[in-house]
Protein backbone atom coordinates (compact mmCIF):
# COMPACT_ATOMS: atom_id res chain seq x y z
CA UNK A 1 0.00 0.00 0.00
CA UNK A 2 1.40 3.38 -1.02
CA UNK A 3 1.70 5.96 1.80
CA UNK A 4 1.31 9.69 1.12
CA UNK A 5 1.83 12.38 3.76
CA UNK A 6 -0.11 15.62 3.58
CA UNK A 7 -0.18 18.93 5.44
CA UNK A 8 -3.29 20.35 7.04
CA UNK A 9 -4.64 23.16 4.83
CA UNK A 10 -2.63 22.05 1.79
CA UNK A 11 -3.70 20.25 -1.38
CA UNK A 12 -2.70 16.65 -2.10
CA UNK A 13 -2.81 14.72 -5.35
CA UNK A 14 -3.21 10.93 -5.13
CA UNK A 15 -2.23 9.17 -8.34
CA UNK A 16 -3.97 6.35 -10.12
CA UNK A 17 -2.71 5.00 -13.44
CA UNK A 18 -4.30 2.62 -15.91
CA UNK A 19 -2.29 0.46 -18.30
CA UNK A 20 -4.32 1.83 -21.24
CA UNK A 21 -3.31 5.34 -22.19
CA UNK A 22 -6.87 6.49 -22.77
CA UNK A 23 -9.89 7.73 -20.85
CA UNK A 24 -11.71 4.83 -19.29
CA UNK A 25 -14.07 4.50 -16.36
CA UNK A 26 -12.61 4.95 -12.89
CA UNK A 27 -13.74 5.87 -9.44
CA UNK A 28 -12.20 6.72 -6.10
CA UNK A 29 -13.66 5.42 -2.83
CA UNK A 30 -12.71 5.75 0.82
CA UNK A 31 -12.12 2.84 3.22
CA UNK A 32 -15.86 2.70 3.94
CA UNK A 33 -16.45 2.07 0.23
CA UNK A 34 -18.19 5.45 -0.10
CA UNK A 35 -17.69 6.88 -3.57
CA UNK A 36 -15.76 10.16 -3.65
CA UNK A 37 -15.56 10.82 -7.37
CA UNK A 38 -15.35 9.12 -10.77
CA UNK A 39 -16.23 9.71 -14.36
CA UNK A 40 -19.11 9.18 -16.72
CA UNK A 41 -17.59 9.55 -20.14
CA UNK A 42 -15.85 12.91 -20.07
CA UNK A 43 -17.87 14.17 -17.10
CA UNK A 44 -16.66 14.24 -13.49
CA UNK A 45 -19.16 12.73 -11.09
CA UNK A 46 -19.10 13.05 -7.31
CA UNK A 47 -20.35 10.70 -4.62
CA UNK A 48 -21.86 11.40 -1.18
CA UNK A 49 -18.54 11.54 0.73
CA UNK A 50 -17.64 14.30 3.18
CA UNK A 51 -14.96 15.40 0.68
CA UNK A 52 -17.59 16.38 -1.87
CA UNK A 53 -16.74 20.10 -2.12
CA UNK A 54 -12.99 19.58 -1.70
CA UNK A 55 -12.38 16.68 -4.10
CA UNK A 56 -11.42 17.08 -7.74
CA UNK A 57 -9.51 15.39 -10.55
CA UNK A 58 -7.57 16.47 -13.64
CA UNK A 59 -9.64 15.78 -16.74
CA UNK A 60 -6.70 16.77 -18.96
CA UNK A 61 -4.83 13.67 -17.74
CA UNK A 62 -7.60 11.14 -18.30
CA UNK A 63 -6.67 10.63 -21.97
CA UNK A 64 -3.20 9.56 -20.82
CA UNK A 65 -4.66 6.95 -18.45
CA UNK A 66 -4.05 9.04 -15.31
CA UNK A 67 -6.94 9.55 -12.90
CA UNK A 68 -5.72 11.55 -9.90
CA UNK A 69 -7.75 12.37 -6.82
CA UNK A 70 -7.09 15.95 -5.68
CA UNK A 71 -8.12 16.88 -2.16
CA UNK A 72 -7.99 20.58 -1.28
CA UNK A 73 -7.75 22.23 2.12
CA UNK A 74 -6.69 19.01 3.85
CA UNK A 75 -8.00 18.16 7.30
CA UNK A 76 -6.54 15.69 9.80
CA UNK A 77 -9.73 13.63 9.50
CA UNK A 78 -9.08 13.20 5.76
CA UNK A 79 -6.44 10.65 6.79
CA UNK A 80 -7.76 7.40 5.36
CA UNK A 81 -7.11 4.66 2.82
CA UNK A 82 -8.32 5.75 -0.60
CA UNK A 83 -9.09 3.16 -3.27
CA UNK A 84 -8.93 3.81 -6.99
CA UNK A 85 -10.90 1.32 -9.05
CA UNK A 86 -9.91 1.19 -12.71
CA UNK A 87 -9.72 -1.68 -15.27
CA UNK A 88 -10.97 -4.22 -12.69
CA UNK A 89 -7.98 -3.30 -10.51
CA UNK A 90 -7.81 -1.60 -7.15
CA UNK A 91 -5.01 0.76 -6.18
CA UNK A 92 -4.84 1.63 -2.49
CA UNK A 93 -3.22 4.82 -1.17
CA UNK A 94 -2.96 5.57 2.53
CA UNK A 95 -3.15 9.30 3.17
CA UNK A 96 -1.86 10.63 6.50
CA UNK A 97 -2.49 14.32 7.20
CA UNK A 98 -0.47 16.22 9.80
CA UNK A 99 -0.67 19.69 11.23
CA UNK A 100 1.92 21.60 13.26
CA UNK A 101 1.01 24.65 15.29
CA UNK A 102 2.72 26.93 17.77
CA UNK A 103 1.22 27.35 21.23
CA UNK A 104 -1.33 30.17 21.44
CA UNK A 105 0.74 32.68 19.50
CA UNK A 106 3.77 32.91 17.24
CA UNK A 107 4.79 36.22 18.89
CA UNK A 108 6.52 35.40 22.18
CA UNK A 109 8.47 37.43 24.70
CA UNK A 110 12.16 36.80 25.14
CA UNK A 111 12.64 34.21 27.88
CA UNK A 112 9.25 32.60 27.31
CA UNK A 113 8.72 29.03 26.11
CA UNK A 114 7.71 27.91 22.65
CA UNK A 115 5.66 24.75 22.32
CA UNK A 116 5.01 23.21 18.94
CA UNK A 117 2.15 20.72 18.84
CA UNK A 118 1.72 18.07 16.18
CA UNK A 119 -1.79 17.12 15.11
CA UNK A 120 -1.73 13.61 13.73
CA UNK A 121 -4.23 10.95 12.68
CA UNK A 122 -5.12 8.13 15.12
CA UNK A 123 -2.81 5.14 14.87
CA UNK A 124 0.14 7.09 13.49
CA UNK A 125 3.42 7.30 15.38
CA UNK A 126 5.33 10.19 13.87
CA UNK A 127 8.56 11.73 15.09
CA UNK A 128 9.25 15.45 14.76
CA UNK A 129 12.53 17.30 14.43
CA UNK A 130 12.71 21.08 14.24
CA UNK A 131 15.52 23.44 13.39
CA UNK A 132 15.58 26.99 14.71
CA UNK A 133 16.77 30.01 12.69
CA UNK A 134 20.17 29.74 14.39
CA UNK A 135 20.50 26.07 13.50
CA UNK A 136 19.55 24.57 16.86
CA UNK A 137 17.84 21.20 16.48
CA UNK A 138 15.15 19.81 18.78
CA UNK A 139 13.44 16.46 18.60
CA UNK A 140 10.22 15.11 20.04
CA UNK A 141 6.94 13.30 19.62
CA UNK A 142 3.53 14.99 19.62
CA UNK A 143 4.92 18.13 21.28
CA UNK A 144 8.25 19.92 21.20
CA UNK A 145 9.20 22.57 23.72
CA UNK A 146 11.91 25.19 23.76
CA UNK A 147 12.32 27.01 27.03
CA UNK A 148 13.94 30.42 27.43
CA UNK A 149 13.56 31.75 23.89
CA UNK A 150 16.40 34.01 22.78
CA UNK A 151 16.44 36.83 20.25
CA UNK A 152 18.26 34.59 17.74
CA UNK A 153 15.26 32.22 17.82
CA UNK A 154 13.26 34.81 15.88
CA UNK A 155 12.61 33.74 12.31
CA UNK A 156 11.57 30.66 10.39
CA UNK A 157 11.59 27.30 12.12
CA UNK A 158 11.82 24.26 9.83
CA UNK A 159 10.14 21.15 11.16
CA UNK A 160 10.18 17.67 9.66
CA UNK A 161 7.55 15.08 10.49
CA UNK A 162 8.68 11.52 9.79
CA UNK A 163 6.22 8.65 9.41
CA UNK A 164 6.69 5.32 7.58
CA UNK A 165 10.08 6.57 6.27
CA UNK A 166 8.27 9.42 4.54
CA UNK A 167 8.47 13.03 5.56
CA UNK A 168 6.53 16.22 5.40
CA UNK A 169 8.08 19.61 6.13
CA UNK A 170 6.52 22.56 7.95
CA UNK A 171 7.81 26.11 8.21
CA UNK A 172 6.64 28.27 11.10
CA UNK A 173 7.54 31.93 11.56
CA UNK A 174 8.28 32.81 15.17
CA UNK A 175 8.76 36.37 16.38
CA UNK A 176 10.66 36.84 19.64
CA UNK A 177 9.63 40.14 21.18
CA UNK A 178 12.67 41.80 22.71
CA UNK A 179 14.79 44.91 22.76
CA UNK A 180 17.77 44.83 20.38
CA UNK A 181 20.17 45.07 23.32
CA UNK A 182 19.72 43.61 26.77
CA UNK A 183 21.94 46.32 28.23
CA UNK A 184 23.62 49.54 27.17
CA UNK A 185 25.94 52.06 28.77
CA UNK A 186 26.18 55.80 28.11
CA UNK A 187 29.31 57.81 29.04
CA UNK A 188 28.90 61.56 29.44
CA UNK A 189 30.76 64.61 30.77
CA UNK A 190 28.97 66.59 33.43
CA UNK A 191 26.51 69.03 31.88
CA UNK A 192 26.16 67.23 28.54
CA UNK A 193 22.78 66.19 27.20
CA UNK A 194 22.11 62.44 27.49
CA UNK A 195 20.26 60.41 24.85
CA UNK A 196 18.89 56.98 25.77
CA UNK A 197 17.57 54.80 22.93
CA UNK A 198 15.64 51.56 23.29
CA UNK A 199 15.27 50.03 19.80
CA UNK A 200 13.02 46.99 19.48
CA UNK A 201 14.24 43.88 17.69
CA UNK A 202 10.93 43.24 15.92
CA UNK A 203 8.36 45.02 13.81
CA UNK A 204 4.64 44.52 14.09
CA UNK A 205 1.74 46.32 12.42
CA UNK A 206 0.22 47.64 15.63
CA UNK A 207 2.12 47.97 18.85
CA UNK A 208 0.23 48.89 21.99
CA UNK A 209 1.30 48.75 25.62
CA UNK A 210 2.75 50.73 28.48
CA UNK A 211 6.19 51.23 29.92
CA UNK A 212 8.22 52.69 32.75
CA UNK A 213 11.82 53.63 33.46
CA UNK A 214 12.98 52.94 36.99
CA UNK A 215 16.27 54.52 38.00
CA UNK A 216 18.73 53.54 40.70
CA UNK A 217 21.14 56.45 41.17
CA UNK A 218 24.51 55.47 42.61
CA UNK A 219 24.14 58.06 45.34
CA UNK A 220 20.52 57.14 46.21
CA UNK A 221 19.44 54.49 48.67
CA UNK A 222 16.44 53.36 46.63
CA UNK A 223 15.25 53.34 43.05
CA UNK A 224 12.78 55.81 41.66
CA UNK A 225 10.35 55.86 38.73
CA UNK A 226 11.60 58.52 36.32
CA UNK A 227 8.90 58.23 33.65
CA UNK A 228 5.83 56.21 32.71
CA UNK A 229 4.36 56.18 29.22
CA UNK A 230 1.77 54.59 26.96
CA UNK A 231 2.22 53.16 23.50
CA UNK A 232 -0.72 53.15 21.11
CA UNK A 233 -0.20 51.96 17.55
CA UNK A 234 3.48 52.91 17.76
CA UNK A 235 2.67 56.42 19.10
CA UNK A 236 4.24 57.28 22.46
CA UNK A 237 2.53 59.45 25.06
CA UNK A 238 4.01 60.35 28.45
CA UNK A 239 1.78 59.67 31.45
CA UNK A 240 3.97 60.80 34.33
CA UNK A 241 7.47 62.20 34.64
CA UNK A 242 9.54 63.25 37.67
CA UNK A 243 10.42 66.91 38.14
CA UNK A 244 14.07 66.09 38.80
CA UNK A 245 15.31 65.07 36.32
CA UNK A 246 12.76 66.27 33.81
CA UNK A 247 13.08 63.68 31.06
CA UNK A 248 11.75 64.24 27.57
CA UNK A 249 10.46 61.40 25.45
CA UNK A 250 10.16 61.03 21.65
CA UNK A 251 6.67 60.54 20.28
CA UNK A 252 7.64 57.80 17.80
CA UNK A 253 9.48 54.49 17.91
CA UNK A 254 12.22 53.63 18.69
CA UNK A 255 11.65 54.60 22.31
CA UNK A 256 13.88 57.59 22.92
CA UNK A 257 14.56 59.50 26.15
CA UNK A 258 16.52 62.72 26.65
CA UNK A 259 18.05 63.81 29.94
CA UNK A 260 18.76 67.59 29.67
CA UNK A 261 22.10 67.29 31.41
CA UNK A 262 24.34 64.65 32.91
CA UNK A 263 24.93 65.30 36.60
CA UNK A 264 26.74 63.15 39.18
CA UNK A 265 23.50 62.64 41.12
CA UNK A 266 21.92 60.99 38.04
CA UNK A 267 24.73 58.52 37.44
CA UNK A 268 23.55 54.97 37.96
CA UNK A 269 21.47 52.32 36.24
CA UNK A 270 17.95 52.14 34.98
CA UNK A 271 15.57 49.44 33.88
CA UNK A 272 13.08 50.19 31.14
CA UNK A 273 10.14 47.79 31.13
CA UNK A 274 7.57 47.51 28.39
CA UNK A 275 4.32 45.59 28.86
CA UNK A 276 2.65 44.75 25.55
CA UNK A 277 -1.09 44.42 25.15
CA UNK A 278 -2.35 40.82 25.22
CA UNK A 279 1.04 39.52 26.36
CA UNK A 280 1.91 38.14 29.75
CA UNK A 281 5.30 39.30 30.96
CA UNK A 282 7.38 42.34 30.10
CA UNK A 283 10.30 43.32 27.92
CA UNK A 284 13.32 44.68 29.77
CA UNK A 285 16.35 46.76 28.85
CA UNK A 286 18.98 47.89 31.27
CA UNK A 287 20.64 51.24 30.72
CA UNK A 288 23.63 52.67 32.58
CA UNK A 289 24.88 56.22 32.88
CA UNK A 290 28.47 57.11 33.77
CA UNK A 291 29.22 60.80 34.43
CA UNK A 292 32.66 62.43 34.49
CA UNK A 293 33.69 65.66 36.18
CA UNK A 294 37.09 67.39 36.08
CA UNK A 295 37.65 70.22 38.58
CA UNK A 296 40.45 72.41 39.86
CA UNK A 297 40.26 73.54 43.45
CA UNK A 298 43.19 75.62 44.61
CA UNK A 299 46.29 73.49 44.00
CA UNK A 300 44.39 70.25 43.40
CA UNK A 301 43.28 69.00 39.96
CA UNK A 302 40.68 66.22 40.36
CA UNK A 303 38.94 63.89 37.95
CA UNK A 304 35.99 61.80 39.12
CA UNK A 305 33.51 59.39 37.58
CA UNK A 306 30.18 58.27 38.96
CA UNK A 307 28.05 55.38 37.86
CA UNK A 308 28.49 51.67 37.14
CA UNK A 309 32.06 51.29 35.90
CA UNK A 310 33.80 47.95 35.61
CA UNK A 311 36.86 47.38 37.85
CA UNK A 312 39.11 47.07 34.78
CA UNK A 313 38.42 50.63 33.59
CA UNK A 314 41.35 53.03 33.93
CA UNK A 315 41.01 56.66 34.96
CA UNK A 316 43.92 58.93 33.99
CA UNK A 317 44.99 62.56 34.19
CA UNK A 318 47.51 63.79 31.65
CA UNK A 319 48.81 67.03 30.28
CA UNK A 320 48.03 67.29 26.56
CA UNK A 321 50.56 65.42 24.36
CA UNK A 322 52.38 64.08 27.39
CA UNK A 323 52.42 60.81 29.30
CA UNK A 324 49.74 60.30 31.92
CA UNK A 325 50.67 61.85 35.23
CA UNK A 326 48.37 59.50 37.11
CA UNK A 327 46.50 56.34 36.04
CA UNK A 328 44.44 54.23 38.41
CA UNK A 329 41.67 51.64 38.38
CA UNK A 330 39.68 53.90 40.66
CA UNK A 331 36.79 56.32 40.41
CA UNK A 332 38.80 59.42 41.32
CA UNK A 333 42.35 60.60 40.52
CA UNK A 334 44.09 63.88 41.27
CA UNK A 335 47.29 65.84 40.69
CA UNK A 336 48.66 68.31 43.24
CA UNK A 337 50.20 71.52 41.91
CA UNK A 338 49.45 70.78 38.26
CA UNK A 339 51.53 72.43 35.56
CA UNK A 340 49.84 75.07 33.43
CA UNK A 341 48.26 73.83 30.20
CA UNK A 342 45.37 71.76 28.86
CA UNK A 343 44.80 68.69 31.01
CA UNK A 344 42.84 65.65 29.90
CA UNK A 345 40.88 63.33 32.10
CA UNK A 346 40.44 59.96 30.35
CA UNK A 347 38.31 56.95 31.19
CA UNK A 348 39.55 54.02 29.13
CA UNK A 349 39.08 50.30 28.67
CA UNK A 350 42.13 48.38 27.40
CA UNK A 351 43.48 51.52 25.74
CA UNK A 352 40.18 52.53 24.16
CA UNK A 353 38.98 55.92 25.40
CA UNK A 354 35.35 55.83 26.54
CA UNK A 355 35.09 59.32 27.99
CA UNK A 356 37.27 62.40 27.94
CA UNK A 357 37.05 65.75 29.70
CA UNK A 358 39.44 68.68 29.22
CA UNK A 359 40.27 71.32 31.77
CA UNK A 360 42.60 74.30 31.38
CA UNK A 361 45.03 75.02 34.20
CA UNK A 362 46.23 78.63 34.19
CA UNK A 363 49.77 79.59 35.26
CA UNK A 364 49.99 80.78 38.89
CA UNK A 365 51.98 84.04 39.24
CA UNK A 366 53.85 84.50 42.50
CA UNK A 367 52.82 87.80 43.99
CA UNK A 368 55.77 90.00 45.08
CA UNK A 369 56.23 90.43 48.80
CA UNK A 370 55.41 94.00 49.92
CA UNK A 371 58.22 95.84 51.82
Amino acid sequence: KKVVLGKKGDTVELTCTASQKKSIQFHWKNSNQIKILGNQGSFLTKGPSKLNDRADSRRSLWDQGNFPLIIKNLKIEDSDTYICEVEDQKEEVQLLVFGLTANSDTHLLQGQSLTLTLESPPGSSPSVQCRSPRGKNIQGGKTLSVSQLELQDSGTWTCTVLQNQKKVEFKIDIVVLAFQKASSIVYKKEGEQVEFSFPLAFTVEKLTGSGELWWQAERASSSKSWITFDLKNKEVSVKRVTQDPKLQMGKKLPLHLTLPQALPQYAGSGNLTLALEAKTGKLHQEVNLVVMRATQLQKNLTCEVWGPTSPKLMLSLKLENKEAKVSKREKAVWVLNPEAGMWQCLLSDSGQVLLESNIKVLPTWSTPVQP
Epitope: Q129, C130, R131, R134, G135, K136, N137, T156, T158, T160, K167, V168, E169, K171
Partner: antibody, heavy 117, light 107 residues
Framework: EVQLVQSGAEVKKPGESLKISCKGS????????IGWVRQMPGKGLEWMGI????????TYSPSFQGQVTISADKSISTAYLQWSSLKASDTAMYYC??????????WGQGTLVTVSS | DIQMTQSPSSLSASVGDRVTITCRAS??????LAWYQQKPEKAPKSLIY???SLQSGVPSRFSGSGSGTDFTLTISSLQPEDFATYYC?????????FGQGTKLEIK
Protein backbone atom coordinates in the same frame (compact mmCIF):
# COMPACT_ATOMS: atom_id res chain seq x y z
CA GLU B 1 16.35 7.34 -6.35
CA VAL B 2 17.65 10.56 -4.80
CA GLN B 3 20.28 12.20 -7.01
CA LEU B 4 22.19 15.46 -7.00
CA VAL B 5 24.00 16.16 -10.26
CA GLN B 6 26.51 19.00 -10.36
CA SER B 7 27.79 20.99 -13.33
CA GLY B 8 31.21 20.22 -14.81
CA ALA B 9 34.69 21.38 -13.85
CA GLU B 10 35.57 25.03 -14.42
CA VAL B 11 38.88 26.79 -15.13
CA LYS B 12 38.75 30.53 -14.56
CA LYS B 13 41.00 33.56 -14.23
CA PRO B 14 41.13 35.73 -11.08
CA GLY B 15 38.47 38.44 -11.16
CA GLU B 16 36.08 36.46 -13.34
CA SER B 17 32.57 35.50 -12.25
CA LEU B 18 31.20 31.97 -12.02
CA LYS B 19 27.96 30.16 -11.24
CA ILE B 20 27.95 26.39 -10.64
CA SER B 21 24.80 24.30 -10.37
CA CYS B 22 23.35 21.31 -8.57
CA LYS B 23 20.21 19.62 -9.94
CA GLY B 24 18.11 17.51 -7.57
CA SER B 25 15.86 14.63 -8.57
CA UNK B 26 14.07 11.66 -7.02
CA UNK B 27 12.66 13.65 -4.09
CA UNK B 28 10.66 16.79 -3.27
CA UNK B 29 13.31 19.41 -4.08
CA UNK B 30 11.41 22.24 -2.38
CA UNK B 31 11.01 20.32 0.88
CA UNK B 32 14.67 19.94 1.87
CA UNK B 33 17.51 22.36 2.46
CA ILE B 34 20.47 22.11 0.06
CA GLY B 35 23.95 22.78 1.41
CA TRP B 36 27.29 23.64 -0.17
CA VAL B 37 30.62 22.31 1.11
CA ARG B 38 34.13 23.37 0.06
CA GLN B 39 37.16 21.10 0.00
CA MET B 40 40.43 22.82 -0.84
CA PRO B 41 43.19 20.65 -2.37
CA GLY B 42 44.43 18.11 0.21
CA LYS B 43 42.27 19.67 2.94
CA GLY B 44 39.12 18.91 4.92
CA LEU B 45 35.45 19.76 4.45
CA GLU B 46 34.09 23.27 5.13
CA TRP B 47 30.38 24.06 5.56
CA MET B 48 29.59 27.11 3.41
CA GLY B 49 25.86 27.58 3.78
CA ILE B 50 22.41 26.27 2.92
CA UNK B 51 19.29 27.23 1.00
CA UNK B 52 15.65 26.15 1.32
CA UNK B 53 14.50 26.07 -2.34
CA UNK B 54 10.84 26.28 -1.32
CA UNK B 55 11.23 29.95 -0.40
CA UNK B 56 14.95 30.68 -1.07
CA UNK B 57 15.67 31.17 2.65
CA UNK B 58 19.48 31.10 3.04
CA THR B 59 21.98 30.81 5.88
CA TYR B 60 25.72 31.34 5.35
CA SER B 61 28.76 30.45 7.41
CA PRO B 62 30.35 33.75 8.56
CA SER B 63 33.54 32.67 6.71
CA PHE B 64 31.68 32.67 3.38
CA GLN B 65 29.14 35.46 3.94
CA GLY B 66 29.69 38.12 1.28
CA GLN B 67 32.16 35.91 -0.61
CA VAL B 68 29.61 33.73 -2.41
CA THR B 69 25.91 33.75 -3.20
CA ILE B 70 23.69 30.70 -2.85
CA SER B 71 20.47 30.68 -4.86
CA ALA B 72 17.91 28.23 -6.24
CA ASP B 73 15.37 27.90 -9.02
CA LYS B 74 12.66 25.57 -7.76
CA SER B 75 10.98 25.37 -11.18
CA ILE B 76 13.96 23.37 -12.47
CA SER B 77 14.98 21.81 -9.10
CA THR B 78 18.40 23.45 -9.23
CA ALA B 79 20.56 25.15 -6.60
CA TYR B 80 23.45 27.45 -7.46
CA LEU B 81 26.69 28.70 -5.94
CA GLN B 82 28.15 31.82 -7.47
CA TRP B 83 31.12 34.18 -7.25
CA SER B 84 31.21 37.71 -8.66
CA SER B 85 35.02 37.96 -8.60
CA LEU B 86 37.07 34.79 -8.22
CA LYS B 87 40.37 34.60 -6.36
CA ALA B 88 43.14 32.00 -6.65
CA SER B 89 42.22 30.88 -3.11
CA ASP B 90 38.76 29.84 -4.40
CA THR B 91 40.43 26.88 -6.13
CA ALA B 92 38.69 23.85 -4.60
CA MET B 93 36.22 21.04 -5.05
CA TYR B 94 32.67 22.20 -4.27
CA TYR B 95 30.00 19.72 -3.24
CA CYS B 96 26.28 20.25 -2.94
CA UNK B 97 24.40 17.99 -0.54
CA UNK B 98 20.83 17.44 0.62
CA UNK B 99 20.46 18.66 4.16
CA UNK B 100 18.17 16.57 6.35
CA UNK B 101 17.92 19.05 9.24
CA UNK B 102 21.69 19.40 9.50
CA UNK B 103 22.82 15.99 8.30
CA UNK B 104 24.01 15.81 4.68
CA UNK B 105 22.43 12.51 3.63
CA UNK B 106 22.96 12.68 -0.16
CA TRP B 107 25.86 14.38 -1.97
CA GLY B 108 26.54 15.60 -5.49
CA GLN B 109 29.62 14.31 -7.31
CA GLY B 110 31.44 17.63 -6.83
CA THR B 111 32.51 20.46 -9.14
CA LEU B 112 36.21 21.26 -9.38
CA VAL B 113 36.86 24.99 -9.70
CA THR B 114 40.38 26.05 -10.68
CA VAL B 115 41.29 29.74 -10.57
CA SER B 116 44.63 30.57 -12.13
CA SER B 117 46.13 33.40 -14.13
CA ASP C 1 31.67 28.77 16.11
CA ILE C 2 31.84 25.25 17.51
CA GLN C 3 35.25 23.66 16.88
CA MET C 4 35.40 19.94 16.15
CA THR C 5 38.67 18.15 16.86
CA GLN C 6 39.31 14.64 15.60
CA SER C 7 41.97 12.26 16.80
CA PRO C 8 44.10 10.74 15.57
CA SER C 9 44.76 12.68 12.36
CA SER C 10 45.92 9.48 10.70
CA LEU C 11 45.83 5.82 11.65
CA SER C 12 47.37 2.64 10.24
CA ALA C 13 45.51 -0.61 10.74
CA SER C 14 45.07 -4.06 9.23
CA VAL C 15 42.05 -5.85 7.80
CA GLY C 16 40.09 -7.40 10.67
CA ASP C 17 41.26 -4.82 13.25
CA ARG C 18 38.88 -2.94 15.53
CA VAL C 19 39.37 0.79 15.02
CA THR C 20 38.12 3.77 17.03
CA ILE C 21 38.19 7.41 15.94
CA THR C 22 37.26 10.16 18.40
CA CYS C 23 35.74 13.58 17.87
CA ARG C 24 35.54 16.31 20.48
CA ALA C 25 33.30 19.39 20.31
CA SER C 26 34.41 22.72 21.87
CA UNK C 27 30.98 22.94 23.54
CA UNK C 28 28.06 20.59 24.18
CA UNK C 29 26.18 19.57 21.04
CA UNK C 30 23.79 17.00 22.57
CA UNK C 31 23.66 14.13 20.02
CA UNK C 32 23.69 16.32 16.90
CA LEU C 33 26.72 14.66 15.34
CA ALA C 34 27.24 12.92 12.00
CA TRP C 35 30.10 10.80 10.63
CA TYR C 36 31.08 10.71 6.96
CA GLN C 37 33.44 8.53 4.93
CA GLN C 38 35.34 9.95 1.96
CA LYS C 39 37.39 7.95 -0.50
CA PRO C 40 39.96 9.62 -2.82
CA GLU C 41 38.38 11.59 -5.67
CA LYS C 42 34.89 10.78 -4.38
CA ALA C 43 32.15 12.72 -2.60
CA PRO C 44 31.69 12.07 1.13
CA LYS C 45 29.12 9.47 2.17
CA SER C 46 26.93 9.64 5.27
CA LEU C 47 27.53 6.81 7.75
CA ILE C 48 26.03 7.82 11.08
CA TYR C 49 23.63 10.54 12.24
CA UNK C 50 22.37 11.63 15.68
CA UNK C 51 25.71 10.32 17.08
CA UNK C 52 24.68 6.65 17.00
CA SER C 53 22.04 6.01 14.31
CA LEU C 54 23.25 4.03 11.30
CA GLN C 55 22.36 5.46 7.89
CA SER C 56 20.43 2.94 5.81
CA GLY C 57 22.66 0.73 3.67
CA VAL C 58 25.71 1.21 5.90
CA PRO C 59 27.25 -2.06 7.20
CA SER C 60 26.61 -2.85 10.87
CA ARG C 61 30.37 -3.03 11.60
CA PHE C 62 30.18 0.79 11.80
CA SER C 63 28.84 2.22 15.06
CA GLY C 64 28.81 5.58 16.77
CA SER C 65 28.49 6.62 20.39
CA GLY C 66 28.73 9.62 22.67
CA SER C 67 26.83 12.78 23.52
CA GLY C 68 27.65 16.26 24.77
CA THR C 69 31.25 16.88 23.74
CA ASP C 70 32.88 13.47 23.26
CA PHE C 71 32.03 11.09 20.42
CA THR C 72 33.50 7.96 18.86
CA LEU C 73 33.20 6.11 15.57
CA THR C 74 34.06 2.41 15.80
CA ILE C 75 34.67 -0.05 12.99
CA SER C 76 34.44 -3.48 14.63
CA SER C 77 36.29 -5.47 11.96
CA LEU C 78 38.08 -3.47 9.29
CA GLN C 79 37.39 -4.43 5.66
CA PRO C 80 39.55 -3.48 2.65
CA GLU C 81 36.90 -1.02 1.43
CA ASP C 82 36.97 0.87 4.76
CA PHE C 83 40.34 2.52 4.12
CA ALA C 84 39.36 6.16 3.63
CA THR C 85 39.20 9.53 5.40
CA TYR C 86 36.52 9.96 8.08
CA TYR C 87 34.98 13.27 9.13
CA CYS C 88 32.70 14.18 12.02
CA UNK C 89 30.27 17.09 11.74
CA UNK C 90 28.21 18.92 14.34
CA UNK C 91 24.77 20.17 13.42
CA UNK C 92 23.80 21.62 16.77
CA UNK C 93 24.08 25.27 15.74
CA UNK C 94 25.14 27.41 12.78
CA UNK C 95 27.61 27.39 11.24
CA UNK C 96 27.63 23.59 11.16
CA UNK C 97 31.27 22.52 11.30
CA PHE C 98 33.38 19.50 10.38
CA GLY C 99 36.34 17.93 12.13
CA GLN C 100 39.69 18.09 10.29
CA GLY C 101 39.45 14.43 9.26
CA THR C 102 41.11 11.12 10.17
CA LYS C 103 42.93 9.24 7.42
CA LEU C 104 42.69 5.48 7.87
CA GLU C 105 45.51 3.68 6.01
CA ILE C 106 46.52 0.04 5.50
CA LYS C 107 49.35 -1.04 7.78
Amino acid sequence: EVQLVQSGAEVKKPGESLKISCKGSGYSFTGYWIGWVRQMPGKGLEWMGIIYPGDSDTTYSPSFQGQVTISADKSISTAYLQWSSLKASDTAMYYCARDQLGLFDYWGQGTLVTVSS
Amino acid sequence: DIQMTQSPSSLSASVGDRVTITCRASQGISSWLAWYQQKPEKAPKSLIYSASSLQSGVPSRFSGSGSGTDFTLTISSLQPEDFATYYCQQYDSYPYTFGQGTKLEIK
